[in-house]
């Protein structure tokens, strides 16, 4: 029961944290602009991943996707991709946690498969949620040093008398989104192997008996029946893993139309 | 069409008050920003602040705080603006301006001169 | 404050040539998030409220005539009326809506020769 709702814990966690992640990467605000000298301003700017916009005092916002992939900045690039990255991790993650729910029952799928799947979307959720974390944190480090540079040539002369004042961008909500979220991936993650170990089954070696019937000489091994009854020592459930081989049992999952932004 | 219809002229004399109003028709008052501008007497155009439409919160120009009073009914569809302790360098054409898209005054009243005069 | 200064502050062209008129801004008015300029020209003829002629430097507010065109970027920016006709004498003013306070040029008045 509590390996259950460990399993089932950890994959709704894991859903809500890529839902996160998905979100944070869609956002438009990974950095806004800072309004800390001047907090009611007539030109709002804030910058996402695909698109910068500014919102105006009118009330008229406007958007302008980056058109370009070769002008980006690689640290853009390298968030994009660790975000991506994260996301299909944790989409796949997802599918194959579905089939491994103790709650669900596919044919005859054993716990040993499921103890595996398991584990992997565990490990893949872990993966997913240090992708996003790792994305987030390369991006608020960039945005903190262009922070400190920007402060430091606030104003640049022109002429004497012309400035140029260089709009200063500060954390986003997309950030703490995708902090959050990632976070939650991870622990999502851990708890689906945690889960892991409580769904493999015990290993046990049952000894061939010699049973004698009355009045017959007949000894009946128990490998006999190992189709029907699971006794024996080569029954399919005695190792749990199994070094990656598949049974036919386990579904293979591929990335769907919705696992891509 | 969008029009703005402003008050008629005012001839006050110093230390007395002035409220101009501006009616808002064809658009909805609290989808957009009102704007104040002055001009005097062959000079040219200051902006005086606006009102935020959502909120009705004014924010004035540094010259025009404390004497200049913001606000808007939105029941009338209308925004006014209130002058204490009138000056004779108050006299001048008001303006209501609308705050459009680029943070453009597209739709202008066709403005209230108030005449400050012993 | 930003500080505007159009150029020059009267100008006399004959009908049908080309007028131009200079804004200067003392900051950027180039919003780094949609790549526009912020600055607004104006037409105001007298005894009337002025009118919109062009924002974010180089677009016509619709009904606007198109001898009517606006260039420039960063700080420095022109109106340019390509024909002059009877009906443009006015005075022009340009306006930033970068930040706040809006602020005016002092206004450039458009006479004919």
């Known amino acids: 029961m509590a390996v259950t709702a460990c399993q089932g814990l950890g994959f709704v966690v894991s859903l809500i944290g890529i839902a996160g992640i998905i979100a944070a990467t869609c956002m438009d605000q990974w950095s806004t602009q800072d309004l800390y000298n001047n907090p009611v301003t007539a030109v709002f700017n804030y910058q996402g991943l695909w698109r910068s916009c500014v919102r105006e005092s009118s009330g008229f916002t406007e958007c302008r996707g980056y058109f370009t992939l070769l002008g980006l900045p690689a640290m853009l690039q390298a968030v994009r991709a660790l975000m991506i990255v994260g996301i299909v991790l944790g989409a796949i993650g997802l599918l194959v946690s579905i089939f491994a729910l103790k709650c669900i029952r596919i044919g005859s799928m054993e716990d040993s498969a499921k103890a595996n799947m398991t584990l992997t979307s565990g490990i893949m959720f872990i993966v997913s949620g240090l992708c996003a974390i790792a994305g987030v944190s390369v991006f608020a480090n960039m945005l903190v040093t262009n922070f400190w540079m920007s402060t430091a040539n606030m104003y640049t002369g022109m002429g004497g008398m012309v400035q140029t004042v260089q709009t200063r961008y500060t954390f986003g909500a997309a950030l703490f989104v995708g902090w959050v979220a990632g976070g939650l991936t991870l622990i999502g993650g851990v708890m689906m192997c945690i889960a892991c170990r409580g769904l493999a089954p015990e290993e046990t070696n049952y000894k061939a008996v010699s049973y004698h019937a009355s009045g017959h000489s007949v000894a009946y091994k128990p490998g006999g029946f190992k189709a029907s009854t699971g006794f024996g020592s080569n029954t399919k459930n005695k190792k749990i893993y199994d070094g990656g081989a598949r049974t036919e049992d386990e579904v293979q999952s591929y990335p769907s139309k919705h696992d891509y932004v | 069409q969008i029009q703005l219809v402003q008050s008629g002229s005012e001839l006050k004399k110093p230390g007395a008050s002035v409220k101009v109003s501006c009616k808002a028709s064809g658009y909805t008052l609290t989808n957009y920003g009102m704007n104040w501008v002055r001009q005097a007497p062959g000079q040219g155009l200051e902006w005086m602040g606006w009102?935020?439409?959502?909120?009705?919160?004014?924010t004035y120009a540094e010259d025009f705080k404390g004497r200049f009073v913001f606000s808007l009914d939105t029941s009338v569809a209308t925004a006014y603006l209130q002058i204490t302790s009138l000056k004779a360098e108050d006299t001048a054409v008001y303006y209501c301006?609308?705050?459009?898209?680029?943070?453009?005054?597209?739709?202008w009243g066709q403005g209230t001169l108030v005449t400050v005069s012993s | 404050d930003i500080v505007m200064t159009q150029s020059p502050d009267s100008l006399a062209v004959s009908l049908g040539e080309r007028a131009t008129i200079n804004c200067k801004s003392s900051?950027?008015?180039?919003?780094?998030?949609?790549?526009?300029?912020?600055l607004t020209w104006y037409q105001q003829k007298p005894g009337q409220p002025p009118k919109l002629l062009i924002y974010?430097?180089?677009t016509r507010e619709s009904g606007v005539p198109d001898r009517f065109s606006g260039s420039g970027s960063g700080t420095d920016f022109t109106l340019t009326i390509s024909s002059l006709q009877a009906e443009d004498l006015a005075v022009y003013y340009c306006q930033q809506g970068y930040s706040f306070p809006f602020t005016f040029g002092q206004g450039t008045k458009l006479e004919i020769k």
């Open positions: 009102i935020r439409p959502n909120t009705g919160e004014p």
């Open positions: 974010w430097a180089s």
């Open positions: 900051q950027n008015l180039l919003s780094s998030g949609n790549q526009r300029n912020y």
């Open positions: 301006a609308r705050l459009y898209r680029g943070n453009t005054l597209d739709n």
